[in-house]
């Protein structure tokens, strides 16, 4: 499989980490999360095309079958392969609390 | 979250399980596996509208991203949330051994 | 630059009370959360507490329920706590913190020493 | 609440050492673990936050890891201006509480 940087389609076009400024405002968390008031979203994008970051056996399969049945067999899709943990502050009907999230920012990314 | 029956898109048109056949030669595996001959191979296939069988928060927040940014951010993906285990018999210098892939068939699927 | 200055140094009888400042500059003060952090002479950091200054919304460390109050002023970008019935044991220099991600302290003012003596 | 043990509560070494100071939990706190850095008369400062995620403005020779309940903040290779007290800090859950530190002193 080509590493993360060999992207066969140009710099940066391949499934890679990518980072969103998103207000609470944004994520629709206004009326639960008080803090932090804006989170450096990382996330997966980009596209997957033969072998790149294949995570499994199952992503080269989805690979081969897309190449014969592309109307019918979705390319890999870039996803994170695991993720940062996150605090947040949130409101609750006693006050506030805080909450810790282990599943909510990309840490690295692979195509599936 | 909507149930993974409940799609909003029309009856199977949202993520789910697809069972595709498909020969070894159709999976490029013609030159090193001897069985089986022929593979139900079982994919995630299908659309991921807002909130359909969300992996995790990751899987939210996307879909908030998605739909102030559509251009920037790409709509989740249906994926394996887990797989079903599978024996392959392979050629080998020696003559052939039996190996088991973990990784190789979707069991069932989410949006992420 | 973020910056917290806080108030000089005060010098109380045990059993008074004191009001310690911190003013938030080069940002937007309701941007960042406040936390108030203690720390005794050769000893280790004790949180005492954390502020939201949009609306002033606190959460105590339970050791410091009572001892502490914890208030903000919007106007004047400060932060303030108020230190009730000291004692000796109140004698420390305190921190003010700003956090932009409510997990760690990224921002710290210099402290204010705080002497509890008759 | 959580404690937090910190070890060794001194540490003399030789700029150019390769160091490695301990932060023990109480019980598992994944990745809730942020690192210190305080000198004499100064405030701290935030050096490693989330067990092992680097800081900007912070040297490369600081690093981080460890998750659950063992935690290590490493310098591999000991400069002059980094003599002073380390300091562990949990978020895992309120209330936010510290190590007793780590003097980092020379030998």
């Known amino acids: 499989a080509r590493n993360g940087d060999d992207c066969p389609l140009g710099p940066g076009r391949c499934c890679r980490l990518h980072t969103v400024r998103a207000s609470l405002e944004d994520l629709g968390w206004a009326d639960w999360v008080l803090s932090p008031r804006e989170v450096q979203v990382t996330m997966c994008i980009g596209a997957c095309p033969s072998q790149f970051r294949a995570a499994n056996m199952h992503a080269q399969i989805k690979t081969s079958l897309h190449r014969l049945k592309p109307d019918t067999v979705p390319a890999p899709c870039c996803v994170p392969a695991s993720y940062n943990p996150m605090v947040l502050i949130q409101k609750t009907d006693t006050g506030v609390s805080l909450q810790t999230y282990d599943d909510l920012l990309a840490k690295d990314c692979h195509c599936i | 979250a909507r149930n993974g029956d409940d799609c909003p898109l029309g009856p199977g048109r949202c993520c789910r399980l697809h069972t595709v056949r498909a020969s070894l030669e159709d999976l490029g595996w013609a030159d090193w596996v001897l069985s089986p001959r022929e593979v139900q191979v079982t994919m995630c296939i299908g659309a991921c509208p807002s909130q359909f069988r969300a992996a995790n928060m990751h899987a939210q927040i996307k879909t908030s991203l998605h739909r102030l940014k559509p251009d920037t951010v790409p709509a989740p993906c249906c994926v394996p949330a887990s797989y079903n285990p599978m024996v392959l018999i392979q050629k080998t210098d020696t003559g052939v051994s039996l190996q088991t892939y973990d990784d190789l068939l979707a069991k069932d699927c989410h949006c992420i | 630059q973020v910056q917290l200055q806080q108030s000089g140094p005060e010098l109380v009888k045990p059993g008074a009370s004191v009001k310690l400042s911190c003013k938030a500059s080069?940002?937007?003060?309701?941007?960042?959360?406040i936390n108030w952090v203690k720390q005794r002479p050769g000893q280790g950091l004790e949180w005492i507490g954390w502020?939201?200054?949009?609306?002033?919304?606190?959460k105590y460390n339970e050791k410091f329920e009572g001892k502490a109050t914890l208030t903000v002023d919007t106007s004047s970008s400060t932060a303030y706590m108020e230190l009730h019935s000291l004692t000796s044991e109140d004698s420390a220099v305190y921190f003010c913190?700003?956090?932009?991600?409510?997990?760690?302290?990224?921002?710290w003012g210099q402290g204010t020493t705080l002497t509890v003596s008759s | 609440d959580i404690v937090l043990t910190q070890s060794p509560a001194t540490l003399s070494v030789t700029p150019g050492d390769r160091v490695s100071l301990s932060c023990r939990a109480s019980?598992?706190?994944?990745?809730?673990l942020h690192w210190y850095q305080q000198k004499s008369h100064e405030s701290p400062r935030l050096l490693i936050k989330y067990a092992s995620q680097s800081i900007s403005g912070i040297p490369s020779r600081f690093s981080g890891s460890g998750s659950g309940t063992d935690f290590t903040l490493s310098i591999n290779s000991v400069e002059t201006e980094d003599f002073g007290m380390y300091f562990c800090q949990q978020s895992n859950s309120w209330p936010y509480t510290f190590g007793g530190g780590t003097k980092l002193e020379i030998k």
């Open positions: 502020i939201y200054p949009r609306d002033g919304i606190s």
């Open positions: 080069g940002y937007t003060f309701t941007s960042y959360d």
């Open positions: 913190a700003g956090t932009s991600d409510p997990a760690y302290f990224d921002y």
């Open positions: 019980q598992s706190i994944s990745y809730y």
